[in-house]
Interface confidence: low
């Protein structure tokens, strides 16, 4: 799912207040709900009829530093016999997410939000049939 | 996939630099890669063998204000005949994502990162069989 554009309102102060100096805002340290955890079924990437592998990308100047990307293993889906059925398609499920980019200039450290496209997993779909006219 | 804890290093300045005043940091306005877009296959939530519905949650003090959550429509999966097959399971695919929380204290506006658990879609899996001893 996609993240809408910021526009020019979210990060601004109310009109009656003085403007934000120097095009930057105050970001408080600490993360709300930091202890919240994913509770997905075990090994769904292997047990799925549209199985996938994970690749980890690492960047020390990004939070989170680790971003995990899924790749569908097959073009088709795995049937009850464990064989690939190409009458169906394994397709990626994508999600836009925010990360924080750290920018250094000597002792001056600032941060900026960055939009990242993450493939979270795969699902098995009936293909769209294009009829030849 | 889960976001690791912040720890105490990412948002800190280098050791040789004076500490961050008042427990806050400078967040630059603007979003890197803001125009990046999800390019998922059309209507996969309806075409999937583990179909799902979307619910939109709205919060004006969050960026993005709109967060979309998926809910699996069935316990089982949809077979080639369009019937639910309960020998298989539809399971949610979850992703931890960051949002930005806007905090007002009069004209003092600050922001804080918040972790949100998003169900992105569903996939069809072979159930885990628990053998009775």
């Amino acid at each position: 799912r996609k993240i809408p554009k910021v526009g020019h309102t979210f990060f601004q102060k109310p009109e009656s207040c003085p403007p934000v100096p120097g095009g930057s805002m105050k970001l408080d340290i600490g993360i709300i709900n930091e202890n919240q955890r994913v509770s997905m079924s075990r090994n769904i990437e292997s047990r799925s009829t549209s199985p996938w592998n994970y690749t980890v990308t690492w960047d020390p100047n990004r939070y989170p530093s680790e971003v995990v990307q899924a790749q569908c293993r097959n073009l088709g889906c795995i049937n009850a016999q464990g064989k690939e059925d190409i009458s169906m398609n394994s397709v990626p499920i994508q999600q836009e997410t925010l990360v924080v980019r750290r920018k250094h200039q000597g002792c001056s450290v600032s941060f900026q939000l960055e939009k990242v496209l993450v493939t979270v997993g795969c699902t098995c779909v009936t293909p769209v049939i294009h009829h030849v006219q | 996939r889960k976001i690791p804890k912040v720890g105490h290093t990412f948002f800190q300045k280098p050791e040789s630099c004076p500490p961050v005043p008042g427990g806050s940091m400078k967040l630059d306005i603007g979003i890197i890669n803001e125009n990046q877009r999800v390019s998922m296959s059309r209507n996969i939530e309806s075409r999937s063998t583990s179909p799902w519905n979307y619910t939109v949650t709205w919060d004006p003090n969050r960026y993005p204000s709109e967060v979309v959550q998926a809910q699996c429509r069935n316990l089982g999966c949809i077979n080639a005949q369009g019937k639910e097959d309960i020998s298989m399971n539809s399971v949610p695919i979850q992703q931890e994502t960051l949002v930005v929380r806007r905090k007002h204290q009069g004209c003092s506006v600050s922001f804080q990162l918040e972790k949100v658990l998003v169900t992105v879609g569903c996939t069809c899996v072979t159930p885990v069989i628990h053998h009775v001893q």
Epitope: D28 | P60, G106
Partner: antibody
Framework: EVQLEESGGGLVQPGGSLRLSCAAS????????MNWVRQAPGKGLEWISY????????HYADSVKGRFTISRDDATKSLFLQMNRLRADDTAVYYC???????????????????WGTGTTVTVSP | DIQMTQSPSSLSASVGDRVTITCRAS??????LNWYQHKPGEAPKLLIY???TLQRGVPSRFSGSGSGTDFVFTISSLQSDDFATYYC?????????FGGGTKVEVK
Amino acid sequence: EVQLEESGGGLVQPGGSLRLSCAASGFPFSNYEMNWVRQAPGKGLEWISYISVSGGPAHYADSVKGRFTISRDDATKSLFLQMNRLRADDTAVYYCVRREYVTGRNYNYYPYMDVWGTGTTVTVSP
Amino acid sequence: DIQMTQSPSSLSASVGDRVTITCRASQTISDYLNWYQHKPGEAPKLLIYSASTLQRGVPSRFSGSGSGTDFVFTISSLQSDDFATYYCQQTSSTALTFGGGTKVEVK
């Protein structure tokens, strides 16, 4: 001076309706989340409703859900509570309350209620 | 909504006494707990937030502790100005629910 002043209370019969108002002054009302809290005779404080800023989400205590509606008009710096299908156990002093935040040692935000009105009395009786 | 259970509902004490009030949440709320003092005809006053942090200007005889579901509020040496009703309030959810209150009366 930061102030909240409630009005609209009174005597009403069970099943009746009442609309409470709260006039804010001395602070930028539109920037603050607001609440209604009540205190029944001889009882403790009971939070009943919350409204976010900018027409954001509203929340209600189970005891009033489906009967009470909170709303705000930032242009007139007013908070409202529309009370329908009133019952005898709704009899209480109703306070309009501002929600504020303090930042803890761990940099989390901790909400609390910092500015309270003097209250308006609602009596539900046949 | 999260339910807050406060005990005792009332207690009698004398100036100089140590007073302890407990508050239990129906589910874990980490340290999202406030304590207020409420006197008749006055607005409730915040004493403690984040379970144990004293609000600016509040005397050090007031203290709080606890995390998760169980919390304790203590007045180390009761003063004449402290006779009032005390409330805990959870702030872990949008519904900032209160405990039933503890009335501290003169013995």
